[in-house]
């Protein structure tokens, strides 16, 4: 019996009945065995077929078989109800070998020409399976010449049998206080040959509760306990299971914070698996009772480990731990069933005793000493000499614990000295230098240090003076001896002040004329304002209307008198303003250099002379009465003049203060 070609030779060829295309003889038996490479099959088809037809092909036939299985027994020319002829059919081996047997019996009623067939090896597509047959691969099947291989979806690994996909279902750790876990693919059938481990790991103090939900279907056996697939639940205390079958297991209260769930499957079966909903519980903490004037949030039926609550106080109440304030309060329930912090109090906000107001006082409006939420106090300034700046002085204790004005300010009001008050009124008449009386010039400041000079009090801690008067002390402010509140130059009864800093106008050049002859002295302490010590006002924008030519100003000081000595008593003189051109002309003739009188200066005095300020008066104020406000303001600062004070045709020259308001305001606000 010819064997035909075997792999690795090329596997293709032709088969024919003996004597083909002539008729075949009786009593013939011929057998061919065809072998293809592994992973290949054989394909066979007939190009000619003419055999004696007999019932069930008992006489002459061609039999095709593959292994133990007969693929076909063929005879005749065309198929009948009980016999088969190949026609145009193609036949395939089941494996890599195909046996072809030809047989003829002892007689033929007429001549038959037999058969001719062609065969070839072809790749088997192992991935294609007949309906009802098990798939080649669990997940993905990949055919290739001579074979195939399987692969798995993400989350699975190929089993060592090379066909089954085992689930990668171990190492999952659940740390939330509740959750769900299920068999892989649930509710679809779970994978074969898998071993899954799930861990629930909660903080110490929690106890895990397991509930099987929806459906439970794990392969079982009628006699043996879960021999195929099973689910086991392990805690540090005990083991539950194994579980299998179709009945939902009962709730499991593990009394443990750690649970390990193991699920093992074998190579067969088609079951949907299981689903667990887990929750946890812990020892509850005492129910939090909100303190008076406070409330708890969130409100819960019970509070267990890790649960928390916060306390919020009503408006006007604050969180206090004893005397200590808290911005917020949150307590957390601990594993032993106690709260981690003690309950605070919601105490009414207490703004505390209000701060003292310099040069003012405070009155309790709500009640004596009442300083709690919504209490009202009233600040006021010492009458006559101080006035309240910015607000009305009414303050309320607000919920933030601060006394707050109606404008929302938390800082104290300011009692600002009233400026420009004098015991003296002017009749407008020019008369000779006179002795000042108490309260006439309460802004007058005596400056001693090297020479005698003067200045004028601004506010309660600044002195306005001439730059040339304090130039030598600009780097040693503490050397200035500043006295106020006295009429007598040599009197031991005066208010002493000391300088903190001296600010000389940056445009002033010493010994090169007197342009910008202005300076400010900052005192190291505020002075107390009274009838003898009162600041002078700075000129308003409208002040020029009170400083026109021939308007009367008043200069005061302890400077040289007609007798040539410094005055013992404060003296003053009322003098008119001189036309600026007239004054400029007066100082253009020698010995005065051209341009001595600038736009930053004003002149005052009599053409006939006799009324003037003199050496020792430098830095003092030339003041004017603002008839609208009835307050005195500084229009000029005693600066320079003729060598002979009060000389006819010459005038006293004063720094024009209104030109320096921005400079003064900047320095005072900056320092």
């Amino acid at each position: 019996t010819p064997l035909g070609p075997k792999w690795p030779e090329p596997v293709f060829g032709r088969l024919a009945s003996p004597g083909f295309p002539g008729e075949y003889a009786n009593d013939q038996e011929r057998r061919w065995t065809l072998t293809a490479p592994p992973g290949y099959r054989l394909r066979l088809y007939f190009t000619h077929f003419d055999l004696e037809l007999s019932h069930l092909c008992e006489y002459d036939f061609v039999k095709l078989s593959s292994g133990a299985k007969v693929l076909a027994t063929l005879c005749g020319q065309e198929s009948t109800d009980t016999e088969r002829a190949p026609g145009k059919d193609t036949f395939y081996s089941l494996g890599s070998s195909l046996d072809i047997t030809f047989r003829s019996d002892y007689s033929n009623e007429k001549p038959f020409t037999g058969f001719e067939a062609f065969y070839a090896a072809e790749d088997i597509d192992e991935c294609q399976v007949a309906p009802g047959e098990a798939p080649t691969c669990d997940h993905h099947c990949h055919n290739h010449l001579g074979g195939f291989y399987c692969s798995c979806r993400a989350g699975y690994v190929l089993h060592r049998n090379k066909r089954t996909c085992s689930a990668l279902c171990s190492g999952q750790v659940f740390t939330q206080r509740s959750g769900e876990l299920s068999s892989p693919e649930y509710p679809r059938p779970y994978p074969k040959l898998s071993s899954c481990t799930y861990s629930i790991s909660l903080e110490e103090g929690f106890s895990v509760i397991l509930d099987f939900v929806e459906s439970f279907d794990v392969e079982t056996h009628p006699e043996t306990l879960c021999p195929y697939d099973f689910l086991k639940i392990q805690t540090d205390r005990e083991e539950h299971g194994p579980f299998c079958g179709k009945t939902l297991p009962h709730r499991i209260e593990t009394k443990s914070n750690t649970v390990t769930i193991t699920f093992v499957t074998d190579e067969s079966g088609d079951h949907t698996g299981w689903k667990i909903h887990y929750t946890s519980t812990a020892q509850p903490c005492p129910y939090p009772m909100a303190p008076p004037n406070g409330h708890v949030s969130p409100v819960q039926a019970k509070y267990i480990l890790k649960d928390s609550f916060s306390i919020f106080c009503e408006t006007g109440y604050e969180l206090l731990q004893g005397h200590l304030p808290l911005k917020s309060f949150t307590a957390v329930c601990q594993k032993d069933g106690s709260w981690d912090r003690p309950m605070p109090a919601c105490s009414i906000v207490d703004c505390g005793p209000p701060d003292d107001l310099p040069s003012g006082r405070v009155e309790y409006i709500t009640g004596p000493g009442v300083t709690t939420y919504k209490a009202v106090i009233q600040y006021s300034c010492e009458e006559t000499f101080y006035t309240m700046k910015v607000n009305d002085g009414k303050y309320v204790c607000e919920a933030d614990g601060f006394w707050t004005s109606s404008k929302g300010e938390k800082s104290l009001p300011v009692c600002e000295p009233v400026c420009g008050l004098s015991a003296r009124t002017t009749g407008g008449r020019i008369y000779g230098g006179q002795k000042a009386k108490p309260g006439d010039f309460p802004w007058q400041v005596l400056i001693l240090g090297g020479t005698t000079a003067a200045g004028a009090l601004l506010y309660d801690n600044w002195v306005l003076t001439a730059a040339h008067a304090v130039y030598e002390q600009k780097h040693d402010a503490s050397a200035l001896d500043i006295r106020m509140g006295t009429l007598k130059r040599l009197s031991p009864h005066y208010t002493q002040a000391w300088s903190e800093a001296v600010f000389i106008h940056e445009g002033y050049t010493h010994d090169a004329g007197f342009d910008n002859d202005i300076a400010l002295i900052k005192l190291n302490n505020k002075v107390v304002i009274n009838s003898n010590i009162t600041p002078i006002c700075l000129p308003r924008k409208e002040a020029e209307s009170f400083m026109r030519t021939d308007d009367i100003g008043t200069a005061s000081g302890w400077g040289l008198t007609q007798r040539g000595f410094l005055a013992r008593n404060l003296m003053y003189v009322d003098i008119p303003i001189v036309d600026h051109q007239k004054c400029t002309a007066a100082y253009e003739k020698p010995p005065y250099p051209r341009g001595s009188v600038t736009a930053n200066m004003l002149c005052a005095g009599l053409e006939s002379g006799g009324k003037d300020s003199c050496r020792g008066d430098s830095g003092g104020a030339l003041v004017f009465l603002d008839s609208e406000t009835e307050r005195w303001f500084v229009g000029g600062i005693v600066s320079w003049g003729s060598m002979n004070c009060g000389e006819a045709g010459q005038y006293g020259v004063y720094t024009k203060v209104i030109n320096y308001i921005p400079w003064i305001e900047n320095i005072i606000s900056d320092f």
Epitope: Q321, H323, L326, G352, D400, G401
Partner: antibody
Framework: QMQLQESGPGLVKPSQSLSLTCTVT?????????WNWIRQFPGNKLEWMGY???????SYNPSLKSRISITRDTSKNQFFLQLNSVTTEDTATYYC???????WGQGTTLTVSS | DIVMTQSQKLMSTSVGDRVSVTCKAS??????VAWYQQKPGQSPKALIY???YRNSGVPDRFTGSGSGTDFTLTISNVQSEDLAEYFC?????????FGSGTKLEIK
């Protein structure tokens, strides 16, 4: 990790003012709590001087009220102690501490002497 | 001012023993009491606040109890590192006040 660190002069003359700084790291002084100054005299007696709260409100020991001021600079996360008119009785180690004293600084030693 | 009295200035104990430090307030302070430990050359360290709440990081051999006027700090299983001075403090009312201290010595 929250830390408090005191800084100051070490030596001050009688009648002068004492100024100390507490620098806080790892926690904002406006977030919560009271921020205290406490001193410990030779012999270990402790005295609470006062606090400034998260909101800037102050509370002082009445025995020091006329001389003490506690302020803060929120941009630098610092709070300050000023004690005026010091005497030799103010010689002590000065600590800053949070709230009831859950965190303390290392302390700074002050000697008042002419 | 509320006076916090620590009547025992010095207490002797042995390693492994249990010791109780007491503090008495001159008036009711609720539970607003803290306990501090101060080792030589160091700043005080809070052990207990609100009478019985242990500060974080404090070993559980330190426990506090009491309310109103009588307070106790108990150290069970005393260790050699517990050699220190212990202060109580009330933070109930202004001014906050401290006890004079109790020194613990290890025999």
């Amino acid at each position: 990790q929250m830390q408090l660190q005191e800084s100051g002069p070490g030596l001050v003359k009688p009648s002068q003012s004492l100024s100390l700084t507490c620098t806080v790291t790892g926690y904002s002084i406006t977030s919560d709590y009271a921020w205290n100054w406490i001193r410990q005299f030779p012999g270990n007696k402790l005295e609470w001087m006062g606090y400034i709260s998260y909101s800037g409100r102050t509370s002082y020991n009445p025995s020091l009220k006329s001389r003490i001021s506690i302020t803060r600079d929120t941009s630098k996360n610092q709070f300050f102690l000023q004690l005026n008119s010091v005497t030799t009785e103010d010689t002590a180690t000065y600590y800053c501490a949070r709230h009831y004293g859950d965190y303390w600084g290392q302390g700074t030693t002050l000697t008042v002497s002419s | 001012d509320i006076v916090m009295t620590q009547s025992q200035k010095l207490m002797s104990t042995s390693v492994g023993d249990r010791v109780s430090v007491t503090c008495k307030a001159s008036q009711n302070v609720g539970t607003n009491v803290a306990w501090y430990q101060q080792k030589p050359g160091q700043s005080p360290k809070a052990l207990i606040y609100s009478a019985s709440y242990r500060n974080s990081g404090v070993p559980d051999r330190f426990t506090g109890s009491g309310s109103g006027t009588d307070f106790t700090l108990t150290i069970s299983n005393v260790q050699s590192e517990d050699l220190a001075e212990y202060f109580c403090q009330q933070f109930n009312t202004n001014p906050l006040t401290f006890g004079s201290g109790t020194k613990l010595e290890i025999k």
